[in-house]
Interface confidence: medium
């Protein structure tokens, strides 16, 4: 899957502890689950459950594992090559326009509309007009417009795979 990184993701600088495995970089890059040493000579393993890296990289630090917020459930823990996978709790969903928070799903459709899609962790209920069958143009995004992620990775702004 894809990867974008910000300063908030960077783990604090870590000295290479004895338990951290080292290997040599390949073409100046270190494999997933590792970061490069400051002198560029070694690849140092990330610490399981604390930080990770998902792709070949020249990161000076592994990336800090995400902690799921309240209102989210942890689907899978952080490993050295994959961040924590968080998902909105039942009855809530995450929108592309506000990926930082889970929002409550609506309990029903407006008058004159029928429900054709259930609340999921990544989409609100979907409503269509009874007569025309057209989708509601209000808050509810069409299914194909909602935030999703690759197969095996439930939708979450903090989810990724290596």
């Amino acid at each position: 899957e894809s990867a974008l990184i910000t300063q908030q993701d960077l783990a604090p600088q870590q000295r290479a502890a004895p338990q951290q495995k080292r290997s040599s970089p390949s073409e100046g890059l270190c494999p997933p689950g590792h970061h490069i040493s400051e002198d560029g000579r070694d690849c140092i393993s990330c610490k399981y459950g604390q930080d990770y890296s998902t792709h070949w990289n020249d990161l000076l630090f592994c990336l800090r594992c995400t902690r799921c917020d309240s209102g989210e459930v942890e689907l899978s823990p952080c490993t050295t090559t994959r961040n924590t996978v968080c998902q909105c709790e039942e009855g809530t969903f995450r929108e592309e326009d506000s990926p930082e928070m889970c929002r409550k799903c609506r309990t029903g459709c407006p008058r004159g509309m029928v429900k054709v899609g259930d609340c999921t962790p990544w989409s609100d209920i979907e409503c269509v007009h009874k007569e025309s069958g057209t989708k509601h143009s209000g808050e509810v995004p069409a299914v194909e417009e909602t935030v999703t992620s690759s197969p095996g990775t439930p939708a979450s702004p903090c989810s990724l795979s290596g």
Epitope: I5, Q7, D9, E96
Partner: nanobody, 125 residues
Amino acid sequence: EVQLLESGGGEVQPGGSLRLSCAASGRSISNYAMGWFRQAPGKEREFVSASVWNNGGNYYAESVKGRFTISRDNAKNTLYLQMSSLRAEDTAVYYCVVARTPETPITSARGANYWGQGTLVTVKP
């Protein structure tokens, strides 16, 4: 709102090189993660490379490791992708992407990012 304009695409022979540029307008990119994705005809959009802000390091897909180099010039508000030893399988539309907020964590291609319109790279004999 951020606008991204890619350039530098074109047709090149296998083994050749190209340098893609992505000029951002609307805000300074210095504190934001940026990256490149690509989409080949009939295939899913895939991650190519990403740049951490402030020279914190870079990410590369295994398929481009050692051949592509990502860099950025924060003063010019521009992201680059130097592509060398190009192969037929590198043929794709290349998209520049920037994180929507400084707090946006690592995201998927369908996450909360701004996207450019793309520039076509064709590698053929």
